[in-house]
Interface confidence: medium
């Protein structure tokens, strides 16, 4: 089946990097500076990817593949293939419309991409605020006042008015 | 081809004024919002500001709030950025920058990008 195809399609045998040239009687022509075949059998190249602005170069276009973009310090990929990069934020914050800007009371966002989340809320396993919460670090939950029985644990439990790590309903 | 074209850069004194361009071409232009960001001599690249495809909601980073305008004009396939009471600090090559479509998180990325336009702010 192969040998028949090729024998109608004189383009089936162009390989990856090159295209069926019509204007040069279906001949196989390389594939022009900046673009580029990834399968055989094309008629066209495609444009090589160029990353600019805020993309930088991953990987250099060639014959065979395109380029591949990563994104400049200070912003993260988004998207398929990196079609987009969004602005990094420190720790403790998260991207509004207005840029970055701290986590509110009882949230935290330790990365630097993301949004701020609520604090655990360790009372509804039955546990203590061992750790209180950041605006970098969630709460640390521990154990339940119950199981703190006197010389049980070295640790003692803060007992604060308000639960710190409770986050405002 | 999808192309962002900057113009409007220059030399200017402390407290003057200069009001950048950017050229849309090759897209939808009144389907994306749009973005100014800045890279200051050896430092990375700040967002600026931005603006809502219609027009209706623009954001600005705090250091340039109050100083800096966004416009866009959807006819013209084109956005602007005013920039009065210009600082040393606000040195730096200015590039425009397409932002998502449609109201979602993607508007804060940034996918085609001009070459930008330098600005220079020195006495």
């Known amino acids: 089946f192969e040998r028949t195809r090729s024998l109608q399609d004189p383009c089936s045998n162009c390989p990856a990097g090159t295209f069926c040239d019509n204007n040069r009687n279906q001949i196989c022509s390389p594939c022009p500076p900046n673009s580029f075949s990834s399968a055989g059998g094309q008629r066209t190249c495609d444009i090589c990817r160029q990353c600019k602005g805020v993309f930088r170069t991953r990987k250099e276009c060639s014959s065979t593949s395109n380029a591949e973009c990563d994104c400049t310090p200070g912003f993260h990929c988004l998207g398929a293939g990196c079609s987009m990069c969004e602005q990094d934020c420190k720790q403790g914050q998260e991207l509004t419309k207005k840029g970055c800007k701290d986590c509110c009371f009882g949230t935290f966002n330790d990365q630097k991409r993301g949004i701020c989340r609520p604090w655990t809320n360790c009372s509804l396993d039955g546990k203590s605020v061992l750790v209180n919460g950041t605006k970098e670090r969630d709460v640390v939950c521990g154990p339940s006042p119950a199981d703190l029985s006197p010389g049980a644990s070295s640790v003692t439990p803060p007992a604060p008015a308000r639960e710190p790590g409770h986050s405002p309903q | 081809e999808v192309q962002l074209v900057e113009s409007g850069g220059g030399l200017v004194q402390p407290g003057g004024s200069l009001r950048l361009s950017c050229a849309a071409s090759?897209?939808?232009?009144?389907?994306?919002?749009m973005n100014w960001a800045r890279q200051a001599p050896g430092k990375g690249l700040e967002w600026v500001a931005n603006?809502?495809?219609?027009?209706?909601?623009?954001y600005y980073v705090d250091s340039v709030e109050g100083r800096f305008t966004i416009s866009r004009d959807n006819a013209k396939n084109s956005t602007y950025l005013q920039m009065n009471s210009l600082r040393v600090e606000d040195t730096a090559v200015y590039y425009c920058?397409?932002?998502?479509?449609?109201?979602?998180?993607?508007?804060?990325?940034?996918?085609?990008w001009g070459q930008g336009t330098t600005v220079t702010v020195s006495s």
């Open positions: 920058a397409r932002g998502g479509a449609g109201y979602s998180m993607s508007h804060y990325g940034m996918d085609v």
């Open positions: 603006i809502k495809e219609d027009g209706s909601e623009k």
């Open positions: 090759g897209f939808t232009f009144s389907d994306y919002w």
